[in-house]
Structure formats: C-alpha cells, structure tokens
Amino acid sequence: DAEFRHDSGYEVHHQKLVFFAEDVGSNKGAIIGLMVGGVVIA
C-alpha cells in the first residue's frame, strides 16, 4: 500500500485489491484493481 500526501493537506490512500476472475466469470487467474479514496478505479 502506498500513501501520498498532497499540498492540499489531504491524504489519498491507494490500495491494491485482488479478485479471483472465476468469481465474476469463467476465466482463471486474478484481477488486480486499485482503490483510491474508497473507489475501485481499475
């Protein structure tokens, strides 16, 4: 996990989230997303 401090004084937390592909479809492997401020963006 990485934490970035911006000039605005806010802290934005970036967290990598990993899901199994078979939970959402038929593919194998892992799906990696990035959560920024509580929202998964990728």
Partner: nanobody, 124 residues
C-alpha cells in the same frame, strides 16, 4: 459456518521446508475462497496466499512468491501451504481463513472465518 484448524507448524532451519494444513468443518467449504495470513510479533497480519473455490486460481504475496505454494482438496475440506526455502523472516503465526467469493482476496476484511493459527519458527 466454517471452523478452521491449522496444523503442521514447527521449528525449521533456514532453507528448510514445512507443509501447513488447514482442516475445515461445515458443509459450505467449497463456496469459500481460502487464504493464509501470517502475523509476526509486533507486526500487522500479512497476506501470504489465497486459492479460489475450485482451486484453479492462486495468488501470492510478494514476499513468498516462488517459495510457497497453496493448494486445496475440497473432498477433504483441507487447504495446504507448502513452504520451501524458508527464511528467518518467515517466522510468524500462520492463520488460515475463509473469504466470501467476489470479495478482495488480499484484504483481511474479506475473511469471515479464521483459524487460531500455527506457529512457524525459522532459526538455526
């Protein structure tokens, strides 16, 4: 509900191997993604590895990739963690846990059920 009991921990020399087991009770074992976490004294619980419901997909924490292998036997309701090339920094209590499918497998909050853990000590 799922109860989890780990076994297989112990004292091993650096470079050695151990195989941990996690036996589950309850009829719903096969609907859970399963994971291993570890906690060293004074440190936060750390994600080690996870395996999907079918066993066809796995994912590993960076610190154990290439050394540890997770597997499962749904008929026996058991999850395994084969640990090779052990290092002193692998010393910790290892916990098995069950996660709801569709939730992130690398975060503690996804896991509803936890075992008490088994101690692994890597020392010469």
């Amino acid at each position: 509900e799922v109860q989890l009991v780990e076994s297989g921990g112990g004292l091993v020399q650096p470079g050695g191997s151990l195989r941990l087991s996690c036996a589950a009770s309850g009829r719903t074992f096969s609907i859970y993604n399963m994971g291993w976490f570890r906690q060293a004294p004074g440190k936060e619980r750390e994600f080690v590895a996870a395996i999907s419901r079918s066993g066809s997909s796995t994912y590993y924490g960076d610190s154990v990739k290439g050394r540890f292998t997770i597997s499962r036997d749904n008929a026996k309701k058991t999850v395994y963690l084969q640990m090779n090339s052990l290092k002193p920094e692998d010393t910790a209590v290892y916990h098995c846990a069950a996660a709801r499918f569709g939730t992130p497998i690398n975060t503690r909050g996804s896991y509803d059920y936890w075992g008490q853990g088994t101690q692994v000590t890597v020392s010469s």
